[in-house]
Amino acid sequence: FPQDRPFEDTCRGNPGHYYDKAVRRCCYRCPTGLFPTQQCPQRPADCRKQCEPDYYLDEAGRCTACVSCSRDDLVEKMPCAWNSSRVCECQPGMFCAVSVVNSCARCFFHSVCPAGMIVKFPGTAQKNTVCEPASPGVSPACASPENCKEPSSGTIPQAKPTPVSPATSNASTMPLRGGTRLAQEAASKLTRAPGSPSSVGRPSSDPGLSPTQPCPQGSGDCRKQCEPDYYLDEAGRCTACVSCSRDDLVEKTPCAWNSSRICECRPGMICATSATNSCARCVPYPICAAETGTKPQDMAEKDTTFEAPPVGTQPDCSPTPENGEAPASTSPTLSSLVDSQASKTLPIPTSAPIALSSTGK
């Protein structure tokens, strides 16, 4: 439209904007690496960072790994989205006994109400079944099915946990605290020495968390312990450790009780875009080690861009024909530059590029 021409010209003159003919508006040009959240962004707030697959943009604006629901007892409730983590919950028929951020550290099977009790509230993914005494006159055969349930004004009793030794019990499930029942395969891990006091069903102020060792009376030397593959974060929450399962990552530091697993790019690659405790994008290390000595400056200067070829490939380490050099007789390893010059590198840490800050940041 002719009347749009002045707007279009003004817009074109501004490198930070562009003209969108479809909406006939001047739009803000999102900086490199940021993507518009709407068709014609008007301001920087309309642009967002885009994370790698299986990462999301957290509230602090960092790309953070989505939790994994790969455990057998978990199902995906919400997928990994650009601005929110995947959310996992216990599979049907189970409830979460130990919650962690966006997932569950320990799922237990829903209780089956014992004889003489009926279901007051059926179990959900978050809560166990709640049982109540069957009203007088209700046949014991009607104790469990929900359609036999009658209103009751009584209080909701918690089933008394009965210590059962899995070695001798032939029940398919065993009671645990609050009437919780574990499948026998899980229960079989709870065997105890004959004659020892049972800890099954013992009340706990923090279910699913245990001290590092028995706490002496008055001792403060106890800490919460999270499930495997979770760590206790600074806020005191059990948080999933990042996964290093991507082909281009290797584990640098294992998942510990108070710190996440740390992943780094596998040998021969370098991190082009980092992520909390991991790397969102690994690329092949683009500089090949010199065989011996240094090449003349005019022969050695060569600019390349970081690209990510298929995992498993290495950058071409033979000098390019334009350089007029013959290919090296042997293919040097990508660490040979550092290794062969170790005498010159003095005390540079090998685990991280270099640690300079003495402030502990």
Epitope: I270, C279, Y285, A290, K295, E301, K344, T345, I354
Partner: nanobody, 121 residues
């Protein structure tokens, strides 16, 4: 004791140039490769450039043709020449020794104070 100190940052208009310097003490630049990283507020650390011990240079796509890395072994200094700066180049720039040793996630905690570059349109 190994130390790296970056300098040369500042506030400029889009299209202008800056030269960042990184001075090392405690080791010599004829050993490990050196890298330049940057981190914009709220963003992860991004690898910008690597300069090898023998002077070969490498750049990430977004800066290729605009940024130039160089080194002066005699002065134990590496430099990054930033031309045709754009607002999206706004970040804290860091230099790091031996980038072959991968970073621990948020790499910016591993180096010195860095130098702030602010580009306004």
């Amino acid at each position: 004791q190994v130390q790296l100190v970056e300098s040369g940052g500042g506030s400029v208009q889009a299209g202008e140039t800056l030269r960042l310097s990184c001075t090392a003490s405690g080791f010599t630049f004829d050993g490990p490769d050196m890298a330049w990283y940057r981190q914009a507020p709220g963003n992860e650390c991004e690898l910008v450039s690597i300069i090898s011990a023998d002077g070969r240079t490498y750049y990430t796509d977004s800066v290729k043709g605009r940024f130039t890395a160089s080194q002066d072994n005699a002065k134990n200094t590496v430099s990054l020449y930033l031309k045709s700066l754009q607002p999206e180049d706004t970040a804290v720039y860091y230099c790091a020794a031996d980038p072959r040793r991968n970073c621990r996630g948020n790499c910016c905690g591993n180096w010195g104070p860095g130098t702030q570059v602010t580009v306004s349109s």
